[in-house]
C-alpha cells in the first residue's frame, strides 16, 4: 500500500515516542562515535520534519524515502571525515548505494570505552532529574555498541530498564533491588544482540534462502500443529521483518513486527496453543513473548516421513515441480517431529536430502538410488549428540571456569593467530554452554547447545572478518553456515603456527588485580593462559595446569600481602622464571 509520505505513515503507525526512539537507535547504529547530544539534535530535527509531513503529506520533501531523509541528515554531521574517515565517502553516493555504504561501515567492535556503572544513588538521581534523557542515553549507548541490535526488542529492554529504576529508586535498599535487575538486563541484552547478529549474518552473507530455511526449521519446531502453508506465511513475514532491521530500516521493521504479532495472535488457533498468555500482553511484551514461546506439543500419530519423501514414486516429480517448496515441506515435516534436534542439524539433514535428490533424480532409477537416504542421517545426528555428551561430562567434572580454560587452550591451539581478547571472549562464551545447556534433559540439550554455539561462533566470525588473520577461521566461517561448528570442531592444532616471542611484560601483574571483580580477575588469568599457549602451543594440559595453579596461588598470596606491589614485583619475577622452566620457554 503506497503512501504519499513514508515518514508520515511510519510516524502515525508507531507514535511519536517509538518513532523518536527508533530513529535514535538507527542513527547511533550508523554513526557509532558521535556524541549523544549530536544524535539527540538530529533526531529532534527529523521528528519535527515528520510532524510537518503528518500535517500535510504533500509538503516539501515529505515524499522522499526514509533512506534519503535519514542519509541526508547523517551527512550533515560536520566532523564526519575526521571521526569516520572513509565512511564520509558514503555521502557522495546516491541511494540505495549510500545506505549500503553506511551498512558496510558498521563496526562490530567499535573503539568505545567500557560502560562503567555509576553508584546507585547517582543513577537514581539522574533518572529522577531527567527520565527522558536517561532512557535515551541507554538506547544510544546500547545501539552504538551493538550496531545490529534488534531495534524493536531494544525498545522492550528500555521499557524494562525504566521499570527497574521506577521501582528500585523508591526501595529501601536501592542497590539490592536494582543491581540484580541491571545484571539480568545486561546479560540478556548481550545474548539478544548476539542472536540477532547471527540472523543478520545469515541474511547478509548467505542470503534470504538460508534465513528462510532456518526460520522454517525453527518455527516448525515451535508450532508443530500449524499447517505448512501457515508456517510458510509466518516465515515470509518474519524474513521481511529481519531483512528490514538488518538493513537499517528500523521504522518499517518495528511496524511490520507489530503487524506480525497481531496476525499471530488473531490466528492462534491455527498456530499454537501456547500463545494465549503472550497475546494478552502489551505490544512490546507480546512480541518478545511470542519470540521466546515454548514449543507446542507435537500432534499425535504423525505418519512416517518415509512415505512421502522416500517411498513415494513421485518424489522426483514433486521435487521438479517446485524444488524449494518440496525441500521446505521436508524440513517442516522433519522439524515438527524433532524438537530434540538443533536447527543447524535439521538444516544439515535437509541439505543431505537435497544433495541426494539432485544426484538420484538424475538417475534412470531414482528410487533405487535414494531408497537409503535416511541411513545417511544417522552419523549426522550422532556427531553432535556425542560431542555434547563428552563436553557436558567435562563441564560437570571441571565447573564453568576450568571448562572455559579447557576451551581456551583448545581454541588457541586451533587458531593461534586470532587476537587474545577475541579468543578470551569467544572461549568464555563457548564455555557458558555448560551451565546454560548441560542441566537440561537429553531431549533439550542439543537444540540448546548447538544453536547457542552457532551464535557464539558467529561472534568469532564477525570479529575476525573485521581483521582477518587466519585462513582456517575464514574457511570455517564462509564455507557453510550450518557446518561452522563441525568445521571448528574438526580443526586440529595448527602445525604451521610459529610460536609467539616471549615477552615478560605480558606476564607482569600489579596490585590493581586485587580490587577487580571475580569475573575481571578470571579474564586476566584467562588472558595470561591464552598468551602462554601462544608462546608454547605444544605445552601439555598438565604443564599448563601447573603454571595456572601457581599463578592463582601467586595472585592470592600477593593480594593478602601488606606491601602488595612489592610482592607482585618480586614474586612475579620468580613465577615467570619458574613457568619458563616448567614449559621450557
Amino acid at each position: 500500500d503506497a503512501h504519499k509520505s513514508e515518514v508520515a505513515h511510519r510516524f502515525k503507525d508507531l507514535g511519536e515516542e517509538n518513532f523518536k526512539a527508533l530513529v535514535l537507535i538507527a542513527f547511533a547504529q550508523y554513526l557509532q562515535q558521535c556524541p549523544f547530544e549530536d544524535h539527540v539534535k538530529l533526531v529532534n530535527e527529523v521528528t519535527e520534519f515528520a510532524k510537518t509531513c503528518v500535517a500535510d503529506e504533500s509538503a516539501e520533501n515529505c515524499d522522499k524515502s526514509l533512506h534519503t531523509l535519514f542519509g541526508d541528515k547523517l551527512c550533515t554531521v560536520a566532523t564526519l571525515r575526521e571521526t569516520y574517515g572513509e565512511m564520509a565517502d558514503c555521502c557522495a553516493k546516491q541511494e540505495p548505494e549510500r545506505n549500503e555504504c553506511f551498512l558496510q561501515h558498521k563496526d562490530d567492535n567499535p573503539n568505545l570505552p567500557r560502560l562503567v556503572r555509576p553508584e546507585v544513588d547517582v543513577m537514581c538521581t539522574a533518572f529522577h532529574d531527567n527520565e527522558e534523557t536517561f532512557l535515551k542515553k541507554y538506547l544510544y549507548e546500547i545501539a552504538r555498541r551493538h550496531p545490529y541490535f534488534y531495534a524493536p526488542e531494544l525498545l522492550f529492554f528500555a521499557k524494562r530498564y525504566k521499570a527497574a529504576f521506577t521501582e528500585c529508586c523508591q526501595a529501601a535498599d536501592k542497590a539490592a533491588c536494582l543491581l540484580p535487575k541491571l545484571d539480568e538486563l545486561r546479560d540478556e541484552g548481550k545474548a539478544s544482540s548476539a542472536k540477532q547478529r547471527l540472523k543478520c549474518a545469515s541474511l547478509q552473507k548467505f542470503g534470504e534462502r538460508a534465513f528462510k530455511a532456518w526460520a522454517v526449521a525453527r518455527l516448525s519446531q515451535r508450532f508443530p500443529k500449524a499447517e505448512f502453508a501457515e508456517v510458510s506465511k509466518l516465515v515470509t513475514d518474519l524474513t521481511k521483518v529481519h531483512t528490514e532491521c538488518c538493513h537499517g530500516d528500523l521504522l518499517e521493521c518495528a511496524d511490520d513486527r507489530a503487524d506480525l504479532a497481531k496476525y499471530i495472535c488473531e490466528n492462534q488457533d491455527s498456530i499454537s496453543s501456547k500463545l494465549k498468555e503472550c497475546c494478552e500482553k502489551p505490544l512490546l511484551e507480546k512480541s518478545h513473548c511470542i519470540a521466546e514461546v515454548e514449543n507446542d506439543e507435537m500432534p499425535a500419530d504423525l505418519p512416517s516421513l518415509a512415505a512421502d519423501f522416500v517411498e513415494s514414486k513421485d518424489v522426483c516429480k514433486n521435487y521438479a515441480e517446485a524444488k524449494d517448496v518440496f525441500l521446505g515441506m521436508f524440513l517442516y515435516e522433519y522439524a515438527r517431529r524433532h524438537p530434540d534436534y538443533s536447527v543447524v542439524l535439521l538444516l544439515r539433514l535437509a541439505k543431505t536430502y537435497e544433495t541426494t535428490l539432485e544426484k538420484c533424480c538424475a538417475a534412470a532409477d531414482p528410487h533405487e538410488c535414494y531408497a537409503k537416504v535416511f541411513d545417511e542421517f544417522k552419523p549426522l545426528v550422532e556427531e553432535p549428540q556425542n560431542l555434547i555428551k563428552q563436553n557436558c561430562e567435562l563441564f560437570e567434572q571441571l565447573g564453568e571456569y576450568k571448562f572455559q580454560n579447557a576451551l581456551l587452550v583448545r581454541y588457541t591451539k586451533k587458531v593461534p593467530q586470532v587476537s587474545t581478547p577475541t579468543l578470551v571472549e569467544v572461549s568464555r562464551n563457548l564455555g557458558k554452554v555448560g551451565s546454560k545447556c548441560c542441566k537440561h534433559p537429553e531431549a533439550k540439550r542439543m537444540p540448546c547447545a548447538e544453536d547457542y554455539l552457532s551464535v557464539v561462533l558467529n561472534q568469532l566470525c564477525v570479529l575476525h572478518e573485521k581483521t582477518p588473520v587466519s585462513d582456517r577461521v575464514t574457511k570455517c566461517c564462509t564455507e557453510s553456515l550450518v557446518n561452522r561448528r563441525p568445521c571448528f570442531s574438526a580443526l586440529e592444532v595448527d602445525e604451521t603456527y610459529v610460536p609467539k616471542e616471549f615477552n615478560a611484560e605480558t606476564f607482569t601483574f600489579h596490585a590493581d588485580i586485587c580490587t577487580l571483580s571475580e569475573k575481571e580477575r578470571q579474564i586476566k588469568k584467562q588472558t595470561a593462559l591464552v598468551e602462554l599457549v601462544k608462546h608454547k602451543p605444544k605445552a601439555t594440559k598438565e604443564q599448563l595446569k601447573a603454571v595456572m595453579d601457581d599463578f592463582a596461588a601467586f595472585v592470592e598470596k600477593c593480594c593478602k600481602a601488606d606491601d602488595k606491589e612489592t610482592c607482585f614485583a618480586e614474586e612475579g619475577k620468580k613465577l615467570v622464571a619458574a613457568s619458563q622452566a616448567a614449559l621450557g620457554l
Epitope: K313, C316, K317, N318, C361, A362, A363, A364, D365
Partner: nanobody
Framework: QVQLQESGGGLVQPGGSLRLTCTAS????????MSWVRQAPGKGLEWVSA????????RYADSVKGRFTISRDNGKKMLTLDMNSLKPEDTAVYYC???????ASQGTQVTVSS
C-alpha cells in the same frame, strides 16, 4: 508449472513402428531422469523404459527389451521412445513422467491392431 506433452501415438499394424515424443517445460529437464509408463485398458500402470539425465543409463522392461529405444535431447527438452516390432499387447496410453513417478499429463494413445 511442470508440463509434459506427449505426441506421436496412433493406430498401427502388428510389426509396425511408431515414434513417441514428449516435450517438457516448467522444470530443469536436463537435471532429471525420465521414464515412459503405459496403461492398457482395464490394467494398472506399467513402467516401460527409463533414461538418466545425461542419457548415459537406459533401462527397459523385459517386455519391450530389444524392440523399444529411449533417447533424449536436453537442448530441446525432449524425450523420445522409438517403438519397433509392435505387438497388440503394446496397446495402451503412453505417458512420459519425471523419474518413475505417476502420470500428470494426457498421454498419447497407441493402438496395435490389424
Amino acid at each position: 508449472q511442470v508440463q509434459l506433452q506427449e505426441s506421436g501415438g496412433g493406430l498401427v499394424q502388428p510389426g509396425g513402428s511408431l515414434r513417441l515424443t514428449c516435450t517438457a517445460s516448467g522444470f530443469t529437464f536436463r537435471s532429471f531422469g525420465m521414464s515412459w509408463v503405459r496403461q492398457a485398458p482395464g490394467k494398472g500402470l506399467e513402467w516401460v523404459s527409463a533414461i538418466s539425465a545425461d542419457g548415459s543409463d537406459k533401462r527397459y522392461a523385459d517386455s519391450v527389451k530389444g524392440r523399444f529405444t529411449i533417447s533424449r535431447d536436453n537442448g530441446k527438452k525432449m524425450l523420445t521412445l522409438d517403438m519397433n516390432s509392435l505387438k497388440p499387447e503394446d496397446t495402451a496410453v503412453y505417458y512420459c513422467v519425471i523419474g518413475r513417478g505417476s502420470p500428470a499429463s494426457q498421454g498419447t494413445q497407441v493402438t496395435v491392431s490389424s
